[in-house]
Structures are given as C-alpha cells and as structure tokens.
C-alpha cells in the first residue's frame, strides 16, 4: 500500500520506492529536498500539468528541515491545515503561497510552525481508514491572492463529479522524479463499486476513489494534499497503488463530507 | 557519535530551584523535539514536557508555573529549572529525543537530584 | 485529559515463554503509541512506536499492536535479557497532560 508521503530526497514510506513489489498498496507521501531531482517533460504528478500561478492559494507543503517536502496540506481556516493523519511528524514546517518546490524566496509565501497537529482519532496506523489530520499554525495567516482557505464540503462526492487534485509529488513511478512547480492534474470521481472491485476489502465511507482511464494520478509526495470539486474541498490525497497511475487502480482519497463536523469542532475546542 | 548528557547539581534544598542541562552531540537540536523525563526512585516515569526547535513548549499539567524548559541559541544544549522542589521531586531526570514520530529514541544516562536541606 | 493504565503491574515468566503486556489509554490515542524497555540503572530503551513499528535494532520477537485504546506489546519468546520493565507512552496529544507514560509492567524470573 503507497502512502503518497516523503523523506530525505527519495520515497521514504513504508516500502522504499526499490523495494515494494509492483502491484502493492502505498501511501502517498515522501521527500523532495532542495536539490531533488526535477522533470522537465510534460508528464505532471502522473500527467497532470503546471497549475496557473495563484489558483491554488489554500495548497499547503509541510517541510521537513532544511527544506525537505514530505506531503502536501490544505488551508480550510485562517489558523488552521487539513493533511492526511499518516503525514503526522513531531517537527515540522508549513510553507504557504510558495509556486516552485525549490526554496527560493517567493514574495507570496508565508512560513509557519505547527503548534498542534490532530489527527483524527479512528486513524490506525498502517491503515487507511479516518485518515486526516488538523494543523493549528502559529498565527493567522494574511490572506493574500496567494494565501486562502478553501471551504471543505459537506456533500458527498458523486460518481462522474470532475475533480482537481494538486501537489508536488513524484511525476513518475515507480521512478521518482519531482516537478519545478506545483502540478494540477484534473480527475473523476469514481462509483463506489469501482473502487471497491480495484481494492477488494480495502475501501469504506471515509474513502472514495478518482482517476481516468489515461494514466493519470498523484503519487509519493502529494500526500495530505487537496482534491476541489466544484470549488470546494472534497478530499484529501490518502494512498494508492504502487507504482502510480496503473489502469484500473485509481488514487484513493479521504472523503472529507464524513468528517465536517469533526472537523469544526476540533477547530472550536482548540482555537 | 549521537549523545546526551544530563548535569547539574546532586542536591537541592526544600524550595529551591533544580537546574539542570542537557547537553546535546551528534545531531542537530535544530531537526528534534526534546523531552525531559523524571523517575522518582522505585516508581515509574513521569513527562516533565517538550520543547521544540521553533521554542514552542508543552507541560505536564502538574509542571506549568514551576517548571520551565529552555534552549540556548547555539542549539547545543537543552535545560531544565523546576522551581520550589520538595522532597516528592527527588528522582532521576532524563533528557531524550524524539525520533520525529513520537518515539524517544535517544535518552541520557540521567541524572539523580535529591532533595533535601 | 488522556491516562495510560498498563496491565499487569508485573508478572512472572520464563525464558521461552511468550509474554503479552497491556496498555489502556483512557481515550482514543489513534496509533500513536510507543513502547520502552528499562533495566535497573539504566536509562529506557525504545522499542516499538507507531504502535507496531520496531525501532532500530530491536530484536524481531518483540511486537506490537493495537490501535484506538487498546494496545498489546508482545514477546514471543522471553530471552534472558528480556527480563526487565516495560512502560507504554502515548504521543497523542501533550494538552492537558498529567503524565504520558502508563504505569510500567515489571517482568521477573518465575
């Protein structure tokens, strides 16, 4: 199973990116550092493309020191970040309103710490179930063109409904290859019989799964990372097959419409 | 070599301040929380708290007001003053690392603090 | 406020014998909790965090898992060395935190 998380300048999950059998589950988060190696083709997360600059103002990257991206996070309140509960570290850094995943200074980011990271409490590591975590930030953020939250939605996703999914993860598998700047990759949410014949026992209601039939999906890195559906936050990048983008085996995301009132009442009890 | 190094003195009196340091080699402070960690003799461990590179710190609900954890700016050392001790702060203290996923992976040898007049 | 009772207080074993250890949180703590092993003298030893993930060089028969409240560490077979005591420690949450660690299981030589 890929967790879509990484670490130190290579997959750095449960199953090292030269370790893990094809065909098995992973999740989606990993390690693009400074000096990670970038893609220069057209092939985007999994063949997604360069997002327009300042579309994706609530899109969050949770550092590791120096400047290593582990997972991707969302900005839902002026204080406080959606990612995914397997993306959890006890030191970490939040950069918002940065384009490239290189560290030079952009004018529009804004950096922060994580005071108080919660995840949700039906999370059980390794698995997949409940997997989502609350950031409480250090301060407010200053809302700019590039710095935003997003609204999560309460509806639940509906099979067909199109989807934007973005990040800066692996833009190949099993090869790691990290992009220059942050990737937009357009999906459709899948039936959750679909989902469930691509990962038989593996799927319930906290999950739902989206993709297409060309070989696009996000990958190690995009972890905790946003899916926006009709310009609100639908889910969150949760795991996947390994390698990425095989046909018939979709990314999986966290289905946040489950999740609302967790969310709001964690975000009251500890504001 | 990754090492802590807890020191300070064996002895404190009743209302006195306990202050010890830990002394960190072999990793940079600036990538670790820290722990501090107490053993009264014969009973179990207690959490004192945690401080992290940013300076943001968490307490043991007991410790808040008398204890405070601190880090000096070259990030070589890591301290603990616990104020208005009794003889129940009589134990061993430890300082540890956390190994970024909620485990502490590298402890000091410790060191015993008794307190008495 | 989230408490660690761990069960039992001891127990008697032999070399060869597998022994499970018992750590109850008070609320759900998710995955995150870790287990040490501590001798006489010395400082603890982590050997489990995440719940069920072995730390760096520990010995493949030590095991755990669990998940929400309940948590088990597990020694399929009791080595000489084993013999010592074994301390539970959430990393949930630090608010409003009287102490992480449970209250410690001693193992001794039945």
């Known amino acids: 199973v890929t967790e879509h998380v990484l670490a130190n300048n290579d997959v750095s999950c449960d199953h090292p990116s030269n370790t893990v059998p094809s065909g098995s589950n992973q999740d989606l988060g990993a390690g693009a550092g400074e000096d990670a190696r970038s893609d220069d083709s057209s092939s985007r997360i999994i063949n997604g493309s360069d997002c327009d600059m300042h579309t994706q103002p609530w899109q969050a990257a949770l550092l590791l020191r120096p400047n290593q991206l582990y997972c991707g996070a969302v900005l839902v309140h002026p204080q406080w970040l959606l990612t995914a509960a397997h993306c959890r570290k006890k030191v970490f850094r939040v950069r918002l309103g940065h384009y490239s995943l290189s560290p030079v200074y952009e004018s529009g980011q804004q950096m922060f710490q994580g005071v108080k990271s919660i995840p949700h409490p039906g999370y059980s590591h390794p698995g997949h179930s409940n997997d989502l975590m609350l950031i409480k930030l250090n301060r407010r953020i200053r809302p700019t063109k590039d710095v935003r939250p997003i609204n999560v939605s309460s509806h639940c996703p509906s099979a067909g409904t199109k989807c934007l999914v973005s990040g800066w993860g692996t833009t190949k598998s099993p090869q790691v290859h990290f992009p220059k700047v942050l990737q937009c990759l357009n999906i459709s949410v899948l039936s959750q019989k679909r989902c469930e014949d691509a990962y038989p026992r593996q799927i319930d209601d906290t999950m739902f799964c989206a993709g297409d039939k060309a070989g696009r999906d996000s990958c190690q890195g995009d972890s905790g990372g946003p899916v926006v559906c009709n310009g609100s936050l639908q889910g969150l990048v949760s795991w996947g097959d390994y390698p990425c983008a095989r046909p018939n085996r979709p990314g999986v995301y966290t289905n946040l419409c489950k999740f609302t009132k967790w969310i709001q009442e964690t975000i009251q009890a500890n504001s | 070599e990754v090492q802590l190094q807890e020191s300070g003195p064996g002895l404190v009196k009743p209302s006195g301040t306990l202050s010890l340091t830990c002394a960190v080699s072999?990793?940079?402070?600036?990538?670790?929380?820290m722990s501090w960690v107490r053993q009264p003799p014969g009973k179990g461990l207690e959490w004192i708290g945690d401080?992290?590179?940013?300076?943001?710190?968490d307490y043991a609900s007991w410790a808040k007001g008398r204890v405070t954890i601190s880090q000096d700016s070259s990030k070589t050392q890591v301290s603990l003053k616990l104020s208005s001790v009794t003889a129940a702060d009589t134990a061993v203290y430890y300082c540890?690392?956390?190994?970024?996923?909620?485990?502490?992976?590298?402890w000091g040898q410790g060191t015993l603090v008794t307190v008495s007049s | 406020a989230i408490d660690m009772t761990q069960s039992p207080s001891s127990l008697s074993a032999s070399v060869g014998d597998r022994v499970t250890i018992t750590c109850q949180a008070s609320?759900?703590?998710?995955?995150?909790l870790a287990w040490y092993q501590q001798k006489p003298g010395k400082a603890p030893k982590l050997l489990i965090y995440l719940a069920s993930t072995l730390a760096s060089g520990v010995p493949s028969r030590f095991s755990g898992s669990g998940s929400g409240t309940d948590f088990t560490l597990t020694i399929s077979s009791l080595q000489p060395e084993d013999f010592a005591t074994y301390y539970c420690q959430q990393g949930y949450t630090n608010s409003n935190i009287i102490n992480t660690f449970g209250g410690g299981t001693k193992v001794e030589i039945k």
């Open positions: 540890a690392r956390d190994n970024n996923d909620y485990g502490l992976d590298i």
């Open positions: 072999g990793f940079p402070l600036s990538n670790y929380a």
């Open positions: 609320q759900s703590i998710s995955s995150w």
């Open positions: 401080i992290y590179p940013s300076d943001i710190i």
